[in-house]
Interface confidence: medium
């Protein structure tokens, strides 16, 4: 892996990306960008998917955290022979199918959809991409849209949770490159540490968990603070404060001593929930310590 | 609270040009899809065609060349016109706004019924 | 373009049991099919979206479950103000289509 900045975030990770013709003589620059970009995100618990579209959507690599998997399917993509037309709702179809999958099979993980597309939709097909970044954001997805050359910033804003959530490269496909750090610090959600990592047995505390991203999610009301308690209780709460890089959190209250806690965050009121390694444990403390 | 309201002529001659207006309240037109669904006495509900909140229109490949709409935004009104009608073209006719986070006609009209006869 | 079949035409139910309404489409329509309700002289209104999301306002009793081409709409104790047309539509591609309707009518 290239040195730089890097996100620890545990969440489903799914590039959608156009192989319509228009993009014939610029794959290697797509390539490269998403072979970087997919680098960063080194967390053991990050999944990755690899999807592309023309006339229909094909996912070339499904869901995975297995990174020679993810080798295989940057293999994959860099084979891809773009041609046929700009029918970017396949692509958010396939997405959304392996997310209601997820939901389905009860691992309620955030996704991330990064969205690449040059061009301009027509309506229909506008209209088809609007509707389906919708459904998997009704699915708990947050979408990034990456623009390129010929696209219409008005489209993307809509496909894409926001205009904020759009990245526009006005200086052709090279320019791919230039962007992959602003990318990443906007859609990387991680959970780094939290403070105290170890509480008092049978008390209750307030928690500072740091991470990054926090301020990304569509409504911050809606950010949850999760304690996954000996891998099994889930509770959820809601923070006192919601900073970008850090929240402030009532703990629950562990009885007993030993008990661990994994920490999750979810952004959508508990639709869905970033997973991490960070764990809070419990121990005995006596009076006045 | 949204509204839509209907409004125009009740009886139409056939070959003629059949016109409707619908008037948004509680909410604008520039953001959304706005419909036109009729309903045929004794028939299924038939999707029209939409107008976006961009101005860009598609309509239902079964009215081929015949169907327009158009909108305005300044009365925050859109409308229907269709030529060449016949007495088949007798029905309820309904605005209704559309949103792709639901994919479905979450708000109607109360219906015009308009008649095609001579 | 895709048909929607709904069956039956017509349900005699009294109030209080439980009403089951079916609808196909004539191909994979994943979970975009709606369900709406119409009472002489109204317009329709969407009482479930994506084949099983509620709407606010609409009571518990309806709901909706399926997904491709087998849909079901289930009133688990049918109101008075129940009795009305039921229609299901294709939100999947355009154009969109309604079925034929449901008439829940008094046993």
């Known amino acids: 892996e290239d040195g730089g900045p890097a996100c620890y975030g545990g969440f489903d990770l799914y590039f959608i990306l156009d192989k319509s013709g228009s993009v014939l003589h610029h794959w290697n620059e797509i390539y490269y960008f998403v072979e970087q970009l997919a680098h960063k995100f080194i967390s053991p618990q990050l999944r990755m998917s690899f999807i592309v579209f023309s006339t229909r959507g094909t996912t070339l690599m499904k869901l995975t955290e297995d990174r020679e998997q993810i080798r295989q399917g940057l293999e994959e993509l860099q084979k891809v022979l773009p041609g046929g037309d700009t029918y970017m709702h396949e692509g958010f179809e396939r997405a959304s199918e392996q997310i209601y999958y997820e939901n389905r099979q009860g691992y309620r993980t955030a996704s991330v959809i990064i969205a690449l597309t040059d061009g301009e939709l027509h309506e229909d097909l506008f209209f088809y991409s609007e509707r389906e970044a919708n459904r998997s954001r009704d699915l708990g997805a947050i979408v990034y849209c990456v623009g390129v050359k010929d696209f219409n910033e008005t489209q993307l804003a809509r496909i894409a949770d926001s205009k904020d959530h759009v990245f526009p490269v006005n200086d052709g496909f090279q320019a791919l490159q230039g962007i992959i750090h602003s990318i990443l610090k906007k859609s990387c959600i991680e959970i780094l540490a939290a403070e105290p990592s170890t509480i008092c047995a049978g008390e209750s505390f307030q928690v500072v968990v740091r991470g990054n991203g926090f301020r990304h999610a569509r409504n911050v009301d809606r950010v949850l603070c999760s304690f996954k308690i000996n891998d099994s209780v889930t509770l959820n709460e809601k923070p006192f404060s919601v900073e970008d890089t850090y929240l402030l959190c009532p703990a629950p209250i562990l009885k007993e001593v030993g008990m661990k806690a994994a920490l999750q965050v979810s952004m959508n009121d508990g639709l869905s929930f970033i997973s991490s390694s960070v764990i809070i444990t419990t121990t005995h403390c006596s009076d006045g310590s | 609270e949204v509204q839509l309201q209907e409004s125009g002529p009740g009886l139409v001659k056939p070959s003629e040009t059949l016109s409707l207006t619908c008037t948004v309240t509680g909410d604008s037109i520039s953001s959304d899809y706005w419909n036109w669904v009729r309903q045929a006495p004794g028939q299924r509900l038939e999707w029209m065609g939409y107008?976006?909140?961009?101005?860009?229109?598609y309509t239902n490949p079964s009215l081929k060349s015949r169907i327009t709409i158009n909108r305005d935004t300044s009365k925050n009104q859109f409308s229907l016109q269709l030529n060449s009608v016949t007495p088949e073209d007798t029905a309820v006719y309904y605005c209704?706004?559309?949103?792709?986070?639901?994919?479905?006609?979450?708000?109607w009209g109360q219906g015009t019924t308009v008649t095609v006869s001579s | 373009e895709i048909v929607m079949t709904q069956s039956p035409a017509t349900l005699s139910v009294s109030p209080g049991e439980r009403a089951t309404l079916s609808c196909r489409a004539s191909q994979n329509i994943r979970d975009f099919l709606h369900w709406y309700q119409q009472k002489p002289g109204q317009a329709p209104r969407l009482l479930i979206y994506?084949?099983?999301q509620s709407i606010s306002g609409i009571p518990a009793r309806f709901s909706g479950s399926g997904s491709g081409t087998d849909f079901t709409l289930t009133i688990s104790s049918l109101e008075p103000e129940d009795f009305a047309v039921y229609y299901c539509?294709?939100?999947?591609?355009?154009?969109?289509?309604f079925g034929g309707g449901t008439k829940v009518e008094i046993k």
């Open positions: 209704a706004r559309y949103k792709t986070i639901t994919s479905a006609f979450d708000v």
């Open positions: 539509q294709n939100g999947h591609s355009f154009p969109y289509t």
């Open positions: 107008i976006s909140y961009s101005g860009n229109t």
């Open positions: 994506y084949a099983s």
